[in-house]
């Protein structure tokens, strides 16, 4: 029960996180005009990964897309790439984790396969979350650098007569959404990895006892069942391992659905 809950919660947390990463990537407010200690402007500038916007005091908002690829700063391209990789990995992770959920039965999928899928999706969520956190952090670092550079020459004199006010940008809402979303995706991934450990089938400790009739090489088992050391039809005698490695020709003994909670 605890494993199912951990897996389910991990899935939900990751789902929220990835939705947040998508939202952050699409948001326009990655950087917003710094209003503190600046001349009061009748416009409010803010920028996203894909376009920059200006809201005028009348409420009219105008956005312009970045219609160039080569002309954009390498850092911005890197942030875009990180966020997209995060979204793609997260989306694939979600798809994999849906089939890995213990509460969902798909044909005769074994628990070992579900465990592997849970681990895979968990790792994908962790990488996805790290990509988002890295992307947002790179952008934030870029903002901090530019902020202090523009503060150093807040007013750039033009011939000593006319002054141009430098528009300083500070952290926008998308950065906080991205950090939180990346963190949630990361946590969800860790939960999936933890759930995977509980899902992985452990070795059965059942010791099959062979009874050898004198003068016969046939193993006898009461109750009219076929002579066997396990549940299969293999009649070979095998060395019994207590939770150790199996011999190559041993038939896999799958636990029943009642073996794990």
């Amino acid at each position: 029960m605890a494993v199912t809950a951990c897996q389910g919660l991990g899935f939900v947390v990751s789902l929220i996180g990835i939705a947040g990463i998508i939202a952050a990537t699409c948001m326009d407010q990655w950087s917003t005009q710094d209003l503190y200690n600046n001349p009061v402007t009748a416009v409010f500038n803010y920028q996203g990964l894909w376009r920059s916007c200006v809201r005028e005091s009348s409420g009219f908002t105008e956005c312009r897309g970045y219609f160039t690829l080569l002309g954009l700063p390498a850092m911005l391209q890197a942030v875009r790439a990180l966020m997209i990789v995060g979204i793609v990995l997260g989306a694939i992770g979600l798809l994999v984790s849906i089939f890995a959920l213990k509460c969902i039965r798909i044909g005769s999928m074994e628990d070992s396969a579900k465990a592997n899928m849970t681990l895979t999706s968990g790792i994908m969520f962790i990488v996805s979350g790290l990509c988002a956190i890295a992307g947002v952090s790179v952008f934030a670092n870029m903002l901090v650098t530019n902020f202090w550079m523009s503060t150093a020459n807040m007013y750039t004199g033009m011939g000593g007569m006319v002054q141009t006010v430098q528009t300083r940008y500070t952290f926008g809402a998308a950065l906080f959404v991205g950090w939180v979303a990346g963190g949630l995706t990361l946590i969800g991934g860790v939960m999936m990895c933890i759930a995977c450990r509980g899902l992985a089938p452990e070795e059965t400790n059942y010791k099959a006892v062979s009874y050898h009739a004198s003068g016969h090489s046939v193993a006898y088992k009461p109750g009219g069942f076929k002579a066997s050391t396990g549940f299969g039809s293999n009649t070979k005698n095998k060395k019994i391992y207590d939770g150790g490695a199996r011999t190559e020709d041993e038939v896999q003994s799958y636990p029943s659905k009642h073996d794990y909670v």
Partner: antibody, heavy 120, light 113 residues
Framework: EVQLVESGGGLVQPGGSLRLSCAAS????????MHWVRQAPGKGLEWVAY????????YYVDKLKGRFTVSRDNAKNSLYLQMNSLRAEDTAVYYC?????????????WGQGTLVTVSS | DIVMTQSPDSLAVSLGERATINCKSS????????????LAWYQQKPGQPPKLLIY???TRESGVPDRFSGSGSGTDFTLTISSLQAEDVAVYFC?????????FGGGTKVEIK
């Protein structure tokens, strides 16, 4: 048709108070920011104050802060300018003007103005 | 505050001739966010309120004759009346629309020579 009609002007003694009103019609008043601009006789235009559609933010010209207060009542389609501690230099025609939408913050419609005379 | 300096103070032009008014701001009115200039031009005839002619430095307000045109960027702007008509006799003001307080130029009086 957009119409802005100012009222409340008149003769007032120095140190006195006056409340100007601007009645708006022909547009959705609650969706637009509004300005007060004044013009002393024979002089140029001087921007006084701005109030956004939702009454926040409000901006004033520094020298009038504390003496002048702008407000609005969207339910009554009205804009107000409360002027206290009036001085002779406040004598002017006071215009209310609409902050145009998609016109780069320009003032697209103006009222006819109301004359305020501060004299003893 | 942004200082708007208009020149000349007055201008006498013959009917049908070109009239040019200049406006200079103490700070750039070009907003880097959208690369637009926030400067407006107004016309005020005697006994009337001002009327918006040009916004964004170069965009004519609807209903304004095409003989009026605006140009310039950053700190230097120009209003041009390509062929002066009798009804164009008025005072013309430029206005900073980017920074509060919004400031006006001193005005240029256009008359017929």
């Amino acid at each position: 048709e957009v119409q802005l009609v100012e009222s409340g002007g008149g003769l007032v003694q120095p140190g006195g108070s006056l409340r100007l009103s601007c009645a708006a019609s022909g547009f959705t008043f609650s969706s637009f920011g509004m300005h007060w601009v004044r013009q002393a006789p024979g002089k140029g235009l001087e921007w006084v104050a701005y109030i956004s559609s939702g009454s926040s933010p409000i901006y004033y010209v520094d020298k009038l802060k504390g003496r002048f207060t702008v407000s609005r009542d969207n339910a009554k389609n009205s804009l107000y300018l409360q002027m206290n501690s009036l001085r002779a230099e406040d004598t002017a025609v006071y215009y209310c003007a609409r902050a145009g939408y998609a016109v780069r913050n320009a003032l697209d419609y103006w009222g006819q103005g109301t004359l305020v005379t501060v004299s003893s | 505050d942004i200082v708007m300096t208009q020149s000349p103070d007055s201008l006498a032009v013959s009917l049908g001739e070109r009239a040019t008014i200049n406006c200079k701001s103490s700070q750039s009115l070009l907003n880097v966010g959208n690369q637009k200039n926030y400067l407006a031009w107004y016309q005020q005839k005697p006994g009337q309120p001002p009327k918006l002619l040009i916004y964004g430095a170069s965009t004519r307000e609807s209903g304004v004759p095409d003989r009026f045109s605006g140009s310039g960027s950053g700190t230097d702007f120009t209003l041009t009346i390509s062929s002066l008509q009798a009804e164009d006799v008025a005072v013309y003001f430029c206005q900073n629309d980017l920074f509060y307080p919004l400031t006006f130029g001193g005005g240029t009086k256009v008359e017929i020579k």
